[in-house]
């Protein structure tokens, strides 16, 4: 009887193993079919709008990646609380599943815009390197549906690149003026968002828990208007140690204020970066790798 029970256990374990293997094969087949399908949909290097039809909606790019779509490009997503779907660039490299919330690449877009534009989003949602801001409303819906890591990829005009990463990136809602909240920093560019690089400047340079400001909606801690002076919308304090929506200059610049694309802990206030990508992915993201 004991032998029979042991044999039953062994067979059950074998069945479980076989089930797991079958499941893995199913995922692999699905993935190959989808990759094949996406290759037909891809429109080359420049225009990268990928239409998956109305098969199902995805809440972010990590879901798209884990459903087998491994090609970077613009996809439609609909976060849980969001009333409507919207286009976003999914970066399927760097581990995959990144939802790109902002990009600067060539100065082709005007980032000196008002509250409504920053709220709803603006820019080029067609081309691979197109500049855009996803929209504060969309950032709120995205970052409250899950715990996200924000990764900021920075590059200068001397072909150097650095990154900064923050756990638990959250953006508040319209009523609290899209307040920024960030967690633990890691990376190579230095912690310009939380202003932890010097305790004496943190009170005026940190962006943690700052409300969003634009030239027409001033929520900063400065007597003047940071957004107006720095010609961009951002989570200004008095005013900034990072401003990734600043004016596009070619590297070192001189201006009335430090209004370039600034990441203080890497290149200081008077160097405007060549490119920036702000992208998010769930903290606990595990790629479906077979």
């Amino acid at each position: 009887l004991e032998d029979c029970a042991q044999e039953q256990m062994r067979l059950r374990a074998q069945v479980r193993l076989l089930e797991t293997r079958v499941k893995q094969q199913q995922v692999k087949i699905k993935q190959l079919l989808q990759e094949n399908e996406v290759q037909f949909l891809d429109k080359g290097d420049e225009n990268t709008v990928i239409d998956l039809g109305s098969k199902r909606q995805y809440a972010d790019c990590s879901e798209i990646f884990n459903d087998g779509y491994k090609l970077s490009g613009f996809y439609k997503i609909k976060p849980l609380q969001s009333p409507a779907e919207f286009s976003v660039y999914c970066d399927m490299s760097d581990g995959g599943g990144w939802t790109v919330i902002q990009r600067r690449s060539d100065g082709s877009e005007n980032f000196n815009r008002g509250w409504k534009d920053y709220e709803n989003g603006f820019g080029n949602f067609v081309q691979k390197h197109g500049e855009y801001w996803l929209g504060n409303k969309n950032l709120h819906f995205l970052t409250t549906q899950e715990d996200y890591t924000l990764k900021i990829d920075l590059a200068d005009f001397e072909k150097n690149s650095r990154y900064a990463q923050y756990k638990n990136f959250k953006v508040g809602d319209e009523k609290n003026f899209y307040e920024l909240n960030i967690g633990e920093y890691s990376g190579t560019a230095g912690d310009s968002l939380a202003g932890n690089f010097h305790p004496e400047v943190q009170w005026w340079a940190s962006h943690q828990r700052m409300k969003f400001s634009t030239w027409d909606r001033d929520h900063d801690n400065y007597e003047g208007n940071c957004a107006e002076e720095d010609q961009s919308g951002w989570w200004f304090n008095r005013c900034h140690s990072a401003n990734l929506n600043g004016v596009y200059y070619s590297g070192p610049y001189t201006a009335k204020t430090d209004n370039g694309i600034v990441w203080y802990t890497w290149h200081g206030w008077w160097y405007s970066l060549k490119s920036v990508v702000m992208k998010i992915r769930p903290n606990d993201f595990i790629p479906n790798v077979i």
């Epitope: 199902r56 909606q57 508040g172 809602d173």
Partner: antibody, heavy 116, light 106 residues
């Protein structure tokens, strides 16, 4: 770890009001929506509404407008739901919940019994 | 409001059997969530975004579907699976639940 601790059972008279609480711990209270739901005895679940503690912004199921009022006290990380003009139809277990894309945390439920 | 209809209302199965319960939506939804509830307890998240198992859910459970038709399948039912399973949609406000499928083990 994330916990939502709800207040104890309530026995109330028809026509009266009741305020039940949901105390959050183990996370930053202001960063996540709190949803409220009800489950009548032996029945399914109904979504009442949500509140975003970061701004106290609310969104109600049309069915519960005028019946439920959602509030928060951020100093104590507590969400409240007030139910008014109670009838026997409101006898149910009421849940608070924090829903995310890949997980959900629920309170243990508060039984509200409406009886003369 | 989107109405979710679950069938069957009661499902009786023997250990080791394969069972499937369905959830039909009155109009198309983006994703389906499933909860397991045992008497006297809060609902537990079971399947999220149609087909992803929540943490700690055994691999014998799976979810599938799209549009208006979704299902939860248990490849080999075990005694601990006895519970009521609810589907829920997040696609449009108000968020709604199905009436539940009660799984009984013979």
């Amino acid at each position: 770890q994330v916990q939502l601790q709800q207040s104890g059972p309530e026995l109330v008279k028809p026509g009266a009001s009741v305020k039940i609480s949901c105390k959050a711990s183990g996370y930053t209270f202001t960063d996540y929506y709190i949803n409220w739901l009800r489950q009548k005895p032996g029945q399914g679940l109904e979504w009442i509404g949500w509140i975003y503690p970061g701004s106290a912004n609310t969104n109600y199921n049309e069915k519960f407008k005028g019946k439920a009022i959602l509030t928060v006290d951020t100093s104590s990380s507590t969400a409240y739901m007030q139910l008014s003009s109670l009838t026997s139809e409101d006898t149910a277990v009421y849940f608070c919940a924090r829903w995310l894309l890949r997980s959900a945390y629920w309170g243990q439920g508060t039984l509200v019994t409406v009886s003369a | 409001d989107i109405v979710l209809s679950q069938s069957p209302a009661i499902l009786s199965a023997s250990p080791g059997e394969k069972v499937t319960m369905t959830c039909r939506a009155s109009s198309s939804v983006s994703y389906m969530y499933w909860y397991q509830q045992k008497p006297g307890s809060s609902p537990k998240p079971w399947i999220y975004a149609t087909s992803n198992l929540a943490s700690g859910v055994p691999a014998r459970f799976s979810g599938s579907g799209s549009g208006t038709s979704y299902s939860l399948t248990i490849s080999r039912v075990e005694a601990e699976d006895a519970a009521t399973y609810y589907c829920q949609q997040w696609s449009s406000n108000p968020y709604t639940f199905g009436g539940g499928t009660k799984l009984e083990i013979k």
